[in-house]
């Protein structure tokens, strides 16, 4: 249950200007969250543009099994995880582990969902009660943005830890544990 | 902006049907499943059942099937409830509300403002 | 189906009090929601999944419990607070809303 497979499958993404995803629900996320900085790779010389157009970040694919109290997706459902810091196309590995690490000095750029797709999911239920039918918003692309000076510190926070994980349910925990982790597209730093 | 309008109120008289509507806008009405909760004067919250834009399969909660109704049009982004054969007992205020699932938890974030439904002979 | 039985049904409270709302279900279920609704107005999320706050809503609000009990805090009530509260649960089919607890002023 939860993390059925990762696959470390990554996808160089070079986004397009002008694109803002849907509002999300409004629930609050705990920024709780760790993640790597950097992947732990030296800085490459910084490497100055003013246009979003040549920057790109990694979409990376994750299969999982979606639940709702006692219930569970019948089969898992594949989703994008937007990943790693946005830098210059020509820089940017398209695999993880290989090639130059960049990572920005100037304007501050952050990889973030783009577009969802929703999906039904169909869940199986125990003690024999009637499955259940439920719509999923997954991510379906990536895209790099550019960080405005009207986005504050706490913004940028979010930025970072909605980067670096999945952006829809996660695995099953206590039932009185905080599901604020769960809310991976919000806020309105997107 | 996320947003359910409802139309407006109705009276009716019993044995009479009436057709409530919720304008979806902000986000897409296919992509969430909208749910109709009724409310009588003075009373708590039950729910009526939901309905899937989508395809237009329906759910319903015990009570309710063959008194209500429930269809969309996506091409206007509105979901209906109608309800048939009326009764005194049918004077309520009708909710349209959408469900949102994140994989772990489903809940009602988006609620519409609320249709009075009155029925009087 | 799951009852969900909230106590107390009527509060007065005085701005300032420590209000603790319980809701009860007849089986064990995995999470709850608390709506506050205040009169002529729809229903608003206040806490999702027994504990986690809704966009906006003031940090006096919290949410605790399992199984078959789960509570409501205000820690200290602020006018705008008096309303009705609703808990609600969907871990078993049909869906179902506690009958409700309203807080009056004292």
């Known amino acids: 249950q939860g993390w059925q497979a990762f696959k470390n499958d990554a996808t160089e993404i070079i986004p397009e200007l002008g694109e803002y995803p849907e509002p999300p629900p409004e629930l609050e996320n705990n920024k709780t969250m760790n993640r790597a900085e950097n992947g732990g790779r030296p800085p490459h010389h910084p490497f100055e543009t003013k246009d979003v157009s040549e920057y790109s970040c990694r979409e990376l694919h994750f299969t999982r099994y979606v639940t709702d109290g006692p219930c569970r997706s019948a089969k898992p459902v594949t989703e994008l995880v937007c990943s790693g810091q946005c830098g210059p196309a020509r820089l940017l590995p398209n695999a993880i582990g290989r090639g130059k690490w960049w990572r920005p000095s100037g304007p501050d750029f952050r990889c973030i969902p783009d577009r969802y797709r929703a999906q039904r999911v169909q869940l199986l239920c125990p003690g024999g009660e009637a499955p259940r039918a439920r719509k999923v918003r997954l991510v379906a692309s990536c895209k790099c943005k550019r960080l405005t000076r009207f986005h504050n510190q706490s913004e940028l926070k979010d930025f970072g830890t909605e980067a670096a994980r999945p952006q829809k349910g996660r695995k099953p925990r206590p039932r009185a544990r905080s599901a604020k982790a769960n809310q991976a597209e919000l806020e309105n730093a997107y | 902006e996320v947003q359910l309008v409802q139309s407006g109120a109705e009276v009716k008289k019993p044995g009479a049907s009436v057709k409530v509507s919720c304008k979806a806008s902000g986000f897409d009405i296919k992509d969430y499943y909208i749910h109709w909760v009724r409310q009588a004067p003075g009373q708590g919250l039950e729910w009526i059942g939901r309905v899937d834009p989508d395809n237009g399969e329906t759910e319903f909660a015990p009570k309710f099937p063959g008194k209500v109704t429930m269809t969309t049009d996506t091409s206007i982004s509105t979901a209906y409830m109608e309800l048939s054969r009326l009764r005194s007992d049918d004077t309520a205020v009708y909710y349209c509300a959408r469900e949102d699932y994140d994989g772990t938890y489903t809940w009602f974030p988006y609620w519409g403002q609320g249709t009075l439904v009155t029925v009087s002979s | 189906d799951i009852q969900l039985t909230q106590s107390p049904s009527f509060l007065s409270a005085s701005v300032g009090d420590r209000v603790t709302i319980t809701c009860r279900a007849s089986?064990?279920?995995?999470?709850i929601h608390w709506y506050q609704q205040k009169p002529g107005k729809a229903p608003k999320l206040l806490i999702y999944a027994t504990s986690n706050l809704a966009s906006g809503v003031p940090s006096r609000f919290s949410g605790s419990g399992s199984g078959t009990e789960f509570t409501l805090t205000i820690s200290s009530l602020q006018p705008e607070d008096f309303a009705t509260y609703y808990c609600q649960q969907w871990s078993s089919d049909p869906l179902t809303f506690g009958g409700g607890t309203k807080v009056e002023i004292k």
């Open positions: 089986s064990s279920i995995s999470y």
